[in-house]
């Protein structure tokens, strides 16, 4: 195999530390040159990557959406952490948005578990104790209190 | 979804020449290369040479070297094999392929393929 010399503008830019690969494979918060000499550092709060590699460039941080917080800021080694805002919650099969938790659990269910950034509301029934599916209830099916029924809220 | 179009392929006489092209679309990454491979009936993919898009870095195999010119059109997003003093041994199937990795002369630091052109050498 055989290498002509580099174009001009394969230099890297001052700012981007060097240093050598090893065994073909650049370290943790750098990617590696075209020819495979040098390890090129990402760039601070632009791109990272987490493992030794021979990848072409660094990924893109992760900016927050709106209804996110920032736990931990983007490093050259590690993704940008977001989490959803209180009272929003985003599921493992969902994970593009975050999504309101509900209120309070469907007549004849009683809340187990509390609203987190991870999950909704756990609700299970009554008698059974057996899980409610995690639907949304109908509005109707919410438990209200109702005039002469003492309120028993599941928040 | 990336998407490779070989062409340029065909029937040359020893000595002769061909010009290979290879178009690319859907490519969206921020640095990547594209090379040549070709394959022989009853032979292994042979890595032929690579171009990398945003230094220009070329990498050419020695048997290729002299006889072989790697090319890119940027604004086409489409690279060129031009091949030269053809012989009955360049017969094959040739390959483009697309890498997102630096000096990528392996087969299997190639992500993306093309369905390949044949090229044939005959007097």
């Known amino acids: 195999i055989t290498q002509q010399d580099l174009a001009p503008q394969q230099r890297a830019a001052p700012q981007q530390k060097r240093s050598s690969p090893s065994e073909g494979l650049c370290p943790p918060g750098h990617h590696i040159s075209e020819d495979g000499r040098d390890c090129i550092s990402c760039k601070y709060g632009q791109d990272y990557s987490t493992h030794w590699n021979d990848l072409l460039f660094c990924l893109r941080c992760t900016r927050c959406d709106s209804g996110e917080v920032e736990l931990s800021p983007c490093t050259t080694t590690r993704n940008t952490v977001c989490q959803c805002e209180e009272g929003t919650f985003r599921e493992e099969d969902s994970p593009e948005m975050c999504r309101k938790c509900r209120t309070g659990c469907p007549r004849g269910m009683v809340k187990v578990g509390d609203c987190t950034p991870w999950s909704d509301i756990e609700c299970v029934h009554k008698e059974s104790g057996t899980k409610h599916s995690g639907e949304v209830p109908a509005v109707e099916e919410t438990v209200t209190s109702s005039p002469g029924t003492p309120a028993s809220p599941c928040s | 979804e990336v998407q490779l179009l070989e062409s340029g392929g065909g029937e040359v006489q020893p000595g002769g020449s061909l010009r290979l092209s290879c178009a690319a679309s859907?490519?969206?990454?921020?640095?990547?290369?594209m090379g040549w491979f070709r394959q022989a009936p009853g032979k292994e993919r042979e890595f032929l040479a690579v171009?990398?898009?945003?230094?220009?870095?070329?990498y050419y195999a020695e048997s290729v070297k002299g006889r072989f010119t790697i090319s890119r059109d940027n604004a086409k997003n489409t690279v060129y094999l031009q091949m030269s003093s053809l012989r009955a041994e360049d017969t094959a199937v040739y390959y483009c392929?697309?890498?997102?990795?630096?000096?990528?002369?392996?087969?299997?630091?190639?992500?993306?393929w093309g369905q390949g052109t044949l090229v044939t050498v005959k007097p």
């Open positions: 392929a697309v890498t997102i990795r630096g000096a990528a002369t392996q087969t299997w630091k190639y992500d993306y």
């Open positions: 171009i990398y898009w945003s230094g220009g870095t070329v």
């Open positions: 859907g490519l969206t990454f921020p640095n990547y290369g």
